[in-house]
Amino acid sequence: LSTGVSFFFLSFHISNLQFNSSLEDPSTDYYQELQRDISEMFLQIYKQGGFLGLSNIKFRPG
Amino acid sequence: SVVVQLTLAFREGTINVHDVETQFNQYKTEAASRYNLTISDVSVSDVPFPFSAQSGAG
């Protein structure tokens, strides 16, 4: 069975940011800004075609 | 620091797991200057099919 889509799980640290409780709440400005920056960054990185998008963003303390 | 975890979706056959990681790692310097994000400890793995079928590419 093939979906025509490949999925990859990716994790990384952002060492110059501090985790706080607002990153547990998707309604906060901090969460939304970071999510927007990360989404935009991935569109830049994988702009060569084939990239369909990203999902399931989670933030955790490092 | 903040640990970020997410799922990336690509059209099947257009990229291998090595290039997903390599292309991300090669962008780290630009991420620091453009987004002020200092990225480290990058890890990439393929998602087993049963999970990927549920996760969508939203």
């Epitope: 075609g49 | 056959g13 090595h18």
Partner: antibody, heavy 120, light 107 residues
Framework: QVQLVQSGAEVKKPGASVKVSCKAS????????MHWIRQAPGQGLEWIGY????????HYNQKFKDKATLTADKSASTAYMELYSLRSEDTAVYYC?????????????WGQGTLVTVSS | DIQMTQSPSSLSASVGDRVTITCRAS??????LVWYQQKPGKSPKLLVY???TLTDGVPSRFSGSGSGTQYSLTISSLQPEDVATYYC?????????FGSGTKLEIK
């Protein structure tokens, strides 16, 4: 037409180094990744590593990270592989091979091979 | 590292025979599987990529199939010029390992 022309056969003493070249023509050198593969006499193929001549990014098979260094000269459209601390087990034919362009996960063109013989 | 186990290591068949070579990966390589043909004293030549896509100029008697960890290369009607050693290669993750090869001979 695309061509990868490698330097000639070499005979080296144990402990010596050797630099093998791979001259590319017929395409834009900086837009294709160049890989190196070795084949010991009568044996199979073993992947050494690659260089992206556009960015000079290299990636090595861990087995060869202290054995080989890959470089590229954009102006000469030539890739190089230098092998260090040669031992008799390094006697092999060494190939350069071009990886196809975007989303092309295969080696579409190969050099003719360079035989490196290590013997005292 | 992903190990590629190729079988058989050698094979003798008659002209016109249907021949199948198999390659098993130690992990899922998601169809990033390549087949090469190497004739004695020559460089390898690309036959099949993405597990089943035949490269330009390769005769249609060659075909690739498989998915996940199991792949095969089939020659539907063996010809004298097919005498060679055939290698599979993992192109999913580094190191981009090769199978140990299958030496094909004519009976």
């Amino acid at each position: 037409q695309v061509q990868l022309v490698q330097s000639g056969a070499e005979v080296k003493k144990p402990g010596a180094s050797v630099k093998v070249s791979c001259k590319a023509s017929g395409y834009t050198f900086t837009t294709y990744t160049m890989h190196w593969i070795r084949q010991a006499p009568g044996q199979g193929l073993e992947w050494i590593g690659y260089i992206n001549p556009g960015s000079d990014y290299t990636h090595y098979n861990q087995k060869f990270k202290d054995k080989a260094t890959l470089t590229a000269d954009k102006s000469a459209s030539t890739a190089y592989m230098e092998l260090y601390s040669l031992r008799s087990e390094d006697t092999a034919v060494y190939y350069c091979a071009r990886q196809g362009n975007y989303a092309a996960y295969y080696f579409d063109y190969w050099g003719q091979g360079t035989l490196v013989t290590v013997s005292s | 590292d992903i190990q590629m186990t190729q079988s058989p290591s050698s094979l003798s068949a008659s002209v016109g025979d249907r021949v199948t070579i198999t390659c098993r990966a130690s992990g899922n390589i998601h169809n990033f599987l390549v087949w090469y043909q190497q004739k004695p004293g020559k460089s390898p030549k690309l036959l099949v990529y993405n597990a089943k896509t035949l490269t330009d100029g390769v005769p249609s008697r060659f075909s690739g199939s498989g998915s996940g960890t199991q792949y095969s290369l089939t020659i539907s009607s063996l010809q004298p010029e097919d005498v060679a050693t055939y290698y599979c290669q993992n192109f999913w993750n580094v190191p981009f390992t090769f199978g140990s090869g299958t030496k094909l001979e004519i009976k």
